[in-house]
Amino acid sequence: LQDPCSNCPAGTFCDNNRNQICSPCPPNSFSSAGGQRTCDICRQCKGVFRTRKECSSTSNAECDCTPGFHCLGAGCSMCEQDCKQGQELTKKGC
């Protein structure tokens, strides 16, 4: 028997509380693939992070760094301070 949840498109989740019908992702959440039983919470770009792309019903928010900082890690998981003019970046910092 086909799983009824497989019919739920990205941007929705299969709602067990409503007889496995597809429901829109709740506020501040998304699902990037179909057949999901929950939606994922949107990433918040706060502090030294700034929003490069808003969260949608089907894709997470993307962050970059505020001026004076640059991204490090997959998906800009960290922001590191830029070196001042005349300084160079080493493993220990500027």
Epitope: P9, A10, G11, T12, D15, N17, R18, C22, S23, P24, P26, P27, N28, S29, E54, C55, S56, S57, T58
Partner: antibody, heavy 120, light 111 residues
Amino acid sequence: EVQLVQSGAEVKKPGASVKVSCKASGYTFTSYYTHWVRQAPGQGLEWMGIINPSGGSTSYAQKFQGRVTMTRDTSTSTVYMELSSLRSEDTAVYYCARGAPEYSSSSDYWGQGTMVTVSS
Amino acid sequence: QSALTQPASVSGSPGQSITISCTGTSSDVGGYNFVSWYQQHPGKAPKLMIYDVSKRPSGVSTRFSGSKSGNTASLTISGLQAEDEADYYCNSYTTSSTRWMFGGGTKVTVL
């Protein structure tokens, strides 16, 4: 009886902020989302955003990102919509509407609307 | 983010049937069965007439029906009556960060 009662009309100067309230009664406040929709004079409906009164999570229309803030007070079953940096184009009737049911694709009950006029 | 496309006006005589279209894309109307229709009389708040493409809330006349084909949703009003004269708006869930989108509205005139 389900009711959404909104605050009264407001007149604001450009650059100011406005905070519209929407008091819910007749249902379990935290079980239903609240949408905010506006309508400029003689124009169509425009979706602004949605709030989950249970946890307070929000999603805003791209057009209003950075200018709109939706909050709620569960003790009084009231949702608030604050719009900042007002301009003349923000002159409109602002409606709150209950999402029906919990993760709903529609709004079954609407407030009476709050007229916000932005004028210098 | 542009609105869903509706005809500006549709008219019909009492007793006739009329259909209002609402055209979007595969990212909204075509991608989801979360299409609603609202009726709005002048100076009043909108009223939900159809939700989830074709479901009718209790209290809404059976003369109102909804359907969808591809990227276009439709609202049909059969047995047109004078009180049906109003503005009608479609609304759809979308994949964009603007999660819900309205059509531009259709003014229905009963001749």
